[in-house]
Interface confidence: medium
């Protein structure tokens, strides 16, 4: 069957980095300069995609793969195939309409991307804070109020303990 | 197909002042946050500045608060940089760029400009 398809169509004889040309009688032809084709029995060849701006080349185009782009520090890559980049913003921020804010109180955001996410509710599980969140990191739940109380288990408290959710003066 | 286009790049005295224009077709102009972004020779890339699609969302760099303003023209399609006290450090080429529209700070790969080269010198 490979045989009688590629007698019907010689295009399917073309291998990836080349091109059908129909204006030669269906020879394949390399693709020009700053294009590529992937696969075999192309028409045409694709136009490799140029990293610039805030865009670097992670891997230049070559006759059979497009180029790669990665993003310029303080960017980073946001979309399939690293389409976007995105602004950088410090630890303890996010990044808004208006540029890197910090995040709010009761927030906080541990990556130079993304959004600020609230402190953890120790409470739901039944525990306490053992430490203190910032705008850079979340709380530390510790054992429950009753695990520290005396006579209760093996639980050994932490030293100093301390009321949940005041840092010590 | 999306086109940036900069202008108003030379060379200019420490000091000095210069206007930087981009003229944007191709898209809806007015639905789009632009922001300036330079390279130093050499050196990475800097956002400059942004401005919201309306003219009312401004921020700037640190690296030029109080020197540069940006601006936009929404009947022109144009967005402006002005540029005064001039250093040797602000010495790059500077491209305008469209940020994309679902999140403004993030900018598409093929939505800048080529720059335009702006070198401080005595």
């Known amino acids: 069957f490979e045989r009688t398809r590629s007698l019907q169509d010689p295009c399917s004889n073309c291998p990836a980095g080349t091109f059908c040309d129909n204006n030669r009688n269906q020879i394949c032809s390399p693709c020009p300069p700053n294009s590529f084709s992937s696969a075999g029995g192309q028409r045409t060849c694709d136009i490799c995609r140029q990293c610039k701006g805030v865009f670097r080349t992670r891997k230049e185009c070559s006759s059979t793969s497009n180029a790669e782009c990665d993003c310029t520090p303080g960017f980073h890559c946001l979309g399939a195939g690293c389409s976007m980049c995105e602004q950088d913003c410090k630890q303890g921020q996010e990044l808004t309409k208006k540029g890197c804010k910090d995040c709010c109180f009761g927030t906080f955001n541990d990556q130079k991307r993304g959004i600020c996410r609230p402190w953890t509710n120790c409470s739901l599980d039944g525990k306490s804070v053992l430490v203190n969140g910032t705008k850079e990191r979340d709380v530390v739940c510790g054992p429950s109020p009753a695990d520290l109380s005396p006579g209760a288990s093996s639980v050994t408290p932490p030293a100093p303990a301390r009321e949940p959710g005041h840092s010590p003066q | 197909e999306v086109q940036l286009v900069e202008s108003g790049g030379g060379l200019v005295k420490p000091g000095g002042s210069l206007r930087l224009s981009c003229t944007a077709s191709?898209?809806?102009?007015?639905?789009?946050?632009m922001s300036w972004f330079r390279q130093a020779p050499g050196k990475g890339l800097e956002w400059v500045s942004h401005?919201?699609?309306?003219?009312?969302?401004?921020d700037y760099a640190d690296s030029v608060k109080g020197r540069f303003t940006i601006s936009r023209d929404n009947a022109k399609n144009s967005l402006y940089l002005q540029m005064n006290s001039l250093r040797a450090d602000d010495t790059a080429v500077y491209y305008c760029?469209?940020?994309?529209?679902?999140?403004?700070?993030?900018?598409?790969?093929?939505?800048w400009g080529q720059g335009t080269l702006v070198t401080v010198s005595s």
């Open positions: 760029a469209r940020e994309d529209i679902r999140m403004p700070g993030t900018t598409d790969f093929d939505n």
């Open positions: 191709g898209f809806t102009f007015t639905d789009y946050y």
């Open positions: 401005i919201s699609s309306s003219g009312t969302t401004i």
